[in-house]
């Protein structure tokens, strides 16, 4: 019919039905990072608290060794905030002779590792030049979006410089995912 | 079985089932803040519009006196954006003699008050140094994550300086939560 | 009953029930923007990738000509991130004689167009002054919130300056929505 741009939506009993409280979910919070080996040209991954304080994993969503493990296929909302802090970046010495005027930067990447693809997939990236005038700076980068994931996929959060991550409070730096 | 790392996920009819349209939800939008008393060492809480324009509360999620009231226990996604604006911060006078070079900052905290814990819990914090060169600056801080809440919990948004909050538009500063 | 502060929540089989996997959902990713005509005093809309890479639309959520089309009424979570990058903004020449000290800015707006209202509604806005000292700057603006939408509504993402949008990677600039 002309103008009938959408399929009718009144027939709404679909299968399978499932209780929302049984869906895989996790909210992980920051811990102090122990220096770990990471390969050149690869951002290091953060590790996380998964059971103390505000942190939890439930309904077969598990955390192990920097990774959130996806226990069932479906569409997930994935989010992370990383708060960075540091001393004045190089470029704040404004146009100083003999110093390249390229800004420093901070970057967060949420990465998916999957059996079905040979290399990690960057799902989300937040990247920001840092060119602060004050002596100490701090700021968060927040990311969140929906992705179709497969059972067995692994998620991690990578950062450009692990030494700049604020690990002091669980509400400042965190990582989570839930099945929609 | 070897390699069977997750419990089987084909058995998906769980109880209790409930229609998504019946879940507690709220999206609150900024209003002009009237000066209110707030106690020392405590960031002031914003109050909100809950029914006009884009704002709404539904399915027993109520708003009263700065607080979103949680009507049933479960996992909630909670989010807020606060847009700040101000004049040049002190520290933008670059390394000026006699002025400490500590940056000013802006902070947003989403706080939970619960009767099962004697003090408020900071769920989410976004904090940023502000050290701007231009005369007028403005910028948002966005937060969002999932938390397990109990019936009767109260949520509020606290800010470091209420006078810097941009209250001019409902799309710039907002606060919401929904049961997953 | 006296003291029963919330309606009982144990009776949880409501109608209509529907499987979560059948809900309208979309995640769109950035593409190189072709210059398009846009009207004065109106921010240009971005167009998007809707099927390649991380991008998808499903369950009657369709993308056409810069718009996400809402196929059924309900509460949706809508989000977008736009990463901007540019050369030094005017105002970084600190208090330079003869140059107004007004900061440049970057803005993202998620806009709803609906049959039932004569002009577009701004749902979400992220706006930030840009007054960088370094020669090249880049930064994201993230937005996300829940809104009640009607079947037939259209969503788009508008930006203050399309030429500053980083279109190089699908994880840097994106737009999505899903029915709750």
């Amino acid at each position: 019919l002309k103008g009938q741009e959408f399929a009718p939506s009144h027939q709404q009993v679909y299968a399978p039905l499932r209780a929302d409280g049984d869906k895989p979910r996790a909210h992980l919070t920051v811990v102090r990072q122990t220096p770990t080996q990471h390969f050149k040209n690869q951002f290091p991954a953060l590790h996380w608290e998964h059971e103390l304080g505000l942190a939890f994993t439930k309904n077969r969503m598990n955390y192990t060794n920097k990774f959130l493990l996806i226990p069932e296929s479906g569409d997930y909302f994935i989010y992370s905030q990383v708060t960075f802090r540091g001393m004045t970046s190089e470029c704040s010495e404004i146009r100083q002779a003999g110093r390249p005027n390229k800004p420093d930067s901070i970057t967060v990447v949420i990465t998916k590792v999957t059996d079905s693809y040979p290399e990690p997939t960057q799902l989300l990236m937040g990247t920001k030049s840092v060119c602060e005038v004050g002596s100490n700076w701090f700021q968060p980068i927040y990311l969140g979006a929906m992705f179709s994931l497969q059972e067995g996929d692994k998620l991690m959060v990578n950062v450009s410089d692990i030494s700049l991550v604020d690990y002091t409070k669980e509400d400042k730096t965190f990582f989570g995912a839930f099945l929609l | 079985l070897k390699g069977q790392e997750f419990a089987p996920s084909h058995q998906q009819v769980y109880a209790p089932l409930r229609a998504d349209g019946d879940k507690p939800r709220a999206h609150l939008t900024v209003v002009r803040q009237t000066p209110t008393q707030h106690f020392k060492n405590q960031f002031p809480a914003l109050h909100w519009e809950h029914e006009l324009g884009l704002a709404f509360t539904k399915n027993r999620m109520n708003y009263t006196n700065k607080f979103l009231l949680i009507p049933e226990s479960g996992d909630y996604f909670i989010y807020s954006q606060v847009t700040f604006r101000g004049m040049t911060s002190e520290c933008s006078e670059i390394r000026q003699a006699g002025r400490p070079n500590k940056p000013d900052s802006i902070t947003v905290v989403i706080t939970k008050v619960t009767d099962s814990y004697p003090e408020p819990t900071q769920l989410l914090m976004g904090t940023k140094s502000v050290c701007e060169v231009g005369s007028n600056w403005f910028q948002p801080i966005y937060l969002g994550a999932m938390f397990s809440l109990q019936e009767g919990d109260k949520l509020m948004v606290n800010v470091s300086d209420i006078s810097l909050v941009d209250y001019t538009k409902e799309d710039k500063t907002f606060f919401g939560a929904f049961l997953l | 009953l006296k003291g029963q502060e919330f309606a009982p929540s144990h009776q949880q089989v409501y109608a209509p029930l529907r499987a979560d996997g059948d809900k309208p959902r979309a995640h769109l990713t950035v593409v190189r923007q072709t210059p398009t005509q846009h009207f004065k005093n109106q921010f240009p809309a971005l167009h998007w990738e809707h099927e390649l890479g991380l991008a998808f639309t499903k369950n009657r959520m369709n993308y056409t000509n810069k718009f996400l089309l809402i196929p059924e009424s309900g509460d949706y979570f809508i989000y977008s991130q736009v990463t901007f990058r540019g050369m030094t903004s005017e105002c970084s020449e600190i208090r330079q004689a003869g140059r107004p000290n007004k900061p440049d800015s970057i803005t993202v707006v998620i806009t709803k167009v609906t049959d039932s209202y004569p002009e577009p509604t701004q749902l979400l806005m992220g706006t930030k002054s840009v007054c960088e000292v370094g020669s090249n700057w880049f930064q994201p603006i993230y937005l996300g919130a829940m809104f009640s939408l009607q079947e037939g509504d259209k969503l788009m993402v508008n930006v203050s300056d399309i030429s500053l949008v980083d279109y190089t990677k699908e994880d840097k600039t994106f737009f999505g929505a899903f029915l709750l």
């Epitope: - | 607080f67 009231l69 008050v113 814990y117 | 003291g3």
Partner: antibody, heavy 116, light 106 residues
Amino acid sequence: QVQLVQSGAEVKKPGASVKLSCKASGFDIQDTYMHWVRQAPGQGLEWMGRIDPASGHTKYDPKFQVRVTMTRDTSTSTVYMELSSLRSEDTAVYYCSRSGGLPDVWGQGTTVTVSS
Amino acid sequence: EIVLTQSPGTLSLSPGERATLSCRASSSVSYMYWYQQKPGQAPRLLIYATSNLASGIPDRFSGSGSGTDFTLTISRLEPEDFAVYYCQQWSGNPRTFGGGTKLEIK
């Protein structure tokens, strides 16, 4: 400073009702929850219930559910607890206290004596 | 309701000694709280959320435990510590207190 001041001692006959008050100062009662706890002579502490002053919502111990009513007046930062159908075993010191905000604060207590 | 059982009912110790007070819950609780009460006074919070020291409480007091078994420890008794101690759970409705442990001077 943060404090709770309770109303004075009451002597009541069996079957009567008593309404006790607890006035807060130094904090906004709506930012917390207010509880009532009682202690019979020589006995331990017994939680009766709580009110959320922001909303007026209450939670009561089931053993008091039919006899207790907690209310609040935010304009005066005062919460009230009314106990009806009094009996001799309701003779006790009644305390108000707050949760959801530190420091922990209790009122000085109100002695209620039920005697014919 | 969750029943809290405190032991011992009475503990007789001398100043300078270590006191260990136990509280057992009939079912698992998230957190335990400990109060001190002296004659004629309102209770005073000592420990919240199992192990956090309340403001103004000396660090000779500590709390520990999880699930159903919780402990309040006073590392070195001072004369002003002799009082009645109550545990309380905030996990279930109704909230419940233990019956108390009376700490007396030996």
